[in-house]
Amino acid sequence: MAVTACQGLGFVVSLIGIAGIIAATCMDQWSTQDLYNNPVTAVFNYQGLWRSCVRESSGFTECRGYFTLLGLPAMLQAVRALMIVGIVLGAIGLLVSIFALKCIRIGSMEDSAKANMTLTSGIMFIVSGLCAIAGVSVFANMLVTNFWMSTANMYTGMGGMVQTVQTRYTFGAALFVGWVAGGLTLIGGVMMCIACRGLAPEETNYKAVSYHASGHSVAYKPGGFKASTGFGSNTKNKKIYDGGARTEDEVQSYPSKHDYV
């Protein structure tokens, strides 16, 4: 019962985590304009992995996709790759774990096969979570570096009265969503791995031997049990599950109305 609960909870936690990773990847607010000296600004900039946006006081928001692939910073490409790998692995992990759930019966699938699949999905969730955490952390590091660089350059060339204040960017909501989601996926994966250990069936072989003694008919049944972890090569019904990620081309999004100043 505890094993089923652990497996089920691991699945749910991972599901929430992967949904969060997908949400974070799609979000536009990976970096937001730092309002260091102007808490309310007439023009507010924020950027995502796929496009950058500008929100005006008028309420209009204009977003532009990054239509170049080669012109983008290598770090941004790396973050994109990490997040997509995380999503793909997480999606495959979810698919595998659905079939591995103890509460779901599929044909004559053995417990050893379910244990294997639970472990596989658990590992996939762990790697998926790590990919998301790594991606978000790389982006955060990039922001911190750029933040201090732009701070150092902020008031350069101020010989005259003309100031050119550089726009500095700080952590956006997507980073926090990504960190939490990656952590949840990781926790879910660990729970699946723990559940896997308890899922391993305990095979009890009863070898009945009859001993005929004079005047008595007593049957002795010495019992021995063989514990199988299900990690061996004796696993039957092995299935390989495929998952794929579909990406859509970014399109120019025309200015839309926002509900805040």
Partner: antibody, heavy 118, light 113 residues
Framework: EVQLQQSGAEVKKPGASVKVSCKAS????????MNWVKQAPGQGLEWIGL????????SYNQKFQGKATLTVDKSSSTAYMELSRLRSEDSAVYYC???????????WGAGTTVTVPS | DIVMTQSPDSLAVSLGERATMSCKSS????????????LTWYQQKPGQPPKLLIY???TRESGVPDRFSGSGSGTDFTLTISSVQAEDVAVYYC?????????FGAGTKLELK
């Protein structure tokens, strides 16, 4: 057709308050930010502040903080600006203006003249 | 606050002539996020409210004659009327739309010679 209809001219004693209205028609009132601009006689334009009719969010020019209070009534598609503790230097024409792309004010009311005798 | 400085204070041109007025800001009005300059030009005739001519420094408002054009980037901007008409006699204001408080220039008065 977009129209911003402002209330009539007001003559107020020093220390009094005045509430200027701006009724919007011909567009979605909650979809556009409303600005208020002051123009003293023979002077240039001075931005007072803005209000988002959707959520009531405001931004003020520090100079008018405490002097002007911006509100909206969504049901009647009307924006209001209340000026308190009136002084002779508050005598001016006050315009309401709708904000559009580029934070530009594309439609303006005809203006409300507020006179505060010294 | 961003200070907007317009020049000249007044400008007298003959009908059909070209009129050029300048507007300088104390800070750059170029937004790095969309590479747009948040500068607006208005025309105000006596006894009337201002009328929007140009936004984003160079985008003409619909219904505005094409003799009006805006140019410039960063801190230096120009409004040009290619062929002045009698109805163009007015005061022209530039405005910072980039940073609060939104600020206007003192205006340039266009007159006919």
């Amino acid at each position: 057709e977009v129209q911003l209809q402002q209330s009539g001219a007001e003559v107020k004693k020093p220390g009094a308050s005045v509430k200027v209205s701006c009724k919007a028609s011909g567009y979605s009132f909650t979809g556009y930010t409303m600005n208020w601009v002051k123009q003293a006689p023979g002077q240039g334009l001075e931005w007072i502040g803005l209000i988002n009719p959707y959520n009531g969010g405001t931004s003020y020019n520090q100079k008018f903080q405490g002097k002007a209070t911006l509100t909206v009534d969504k049901s009647s598609s009307t924006a209001y600006m209340e000026l308190s503790r009136l002084r002779s230097e508050d005598s001016a024409v006050y315009y309401c203006a709708r904000m559009n792309y580029g934070n530009a004010m594309d439609y303006w009311g005809a203006g409300t003249t507020v006179t505060v005798p010294s | 606050d961003i200070v907007m400085t317009q020049s000249p204070d007044s400008l007298a041109v003959s009908l059909g002539e070209r009129a050029t007025m300048s507007c300088k800001s104390s800070q750059s009005l170029l937004n790095s996020g969309n590479q747009k300059n948040y500068l607006t030009w208005y025309q105000q005739k006596p006894g009337q409210p201002p009328k929007l001519l140009i936004y984003w420094a160079s985008t003409r408002e619909s219904g505005v004659p094409d003799r009006f054009s805006g140019s410039g980037s960063g801190t230096d901007f120009t409004l040009t009327i290619s062929s002045v008409q009698a109805e163009d006699v007015a005061v022209y204001y530039c405005q910072n739309d980039y940073s609060y408080p939104l600020t206007f220039g003192a205006g340039t008065k266009l007159e006919l010679k």
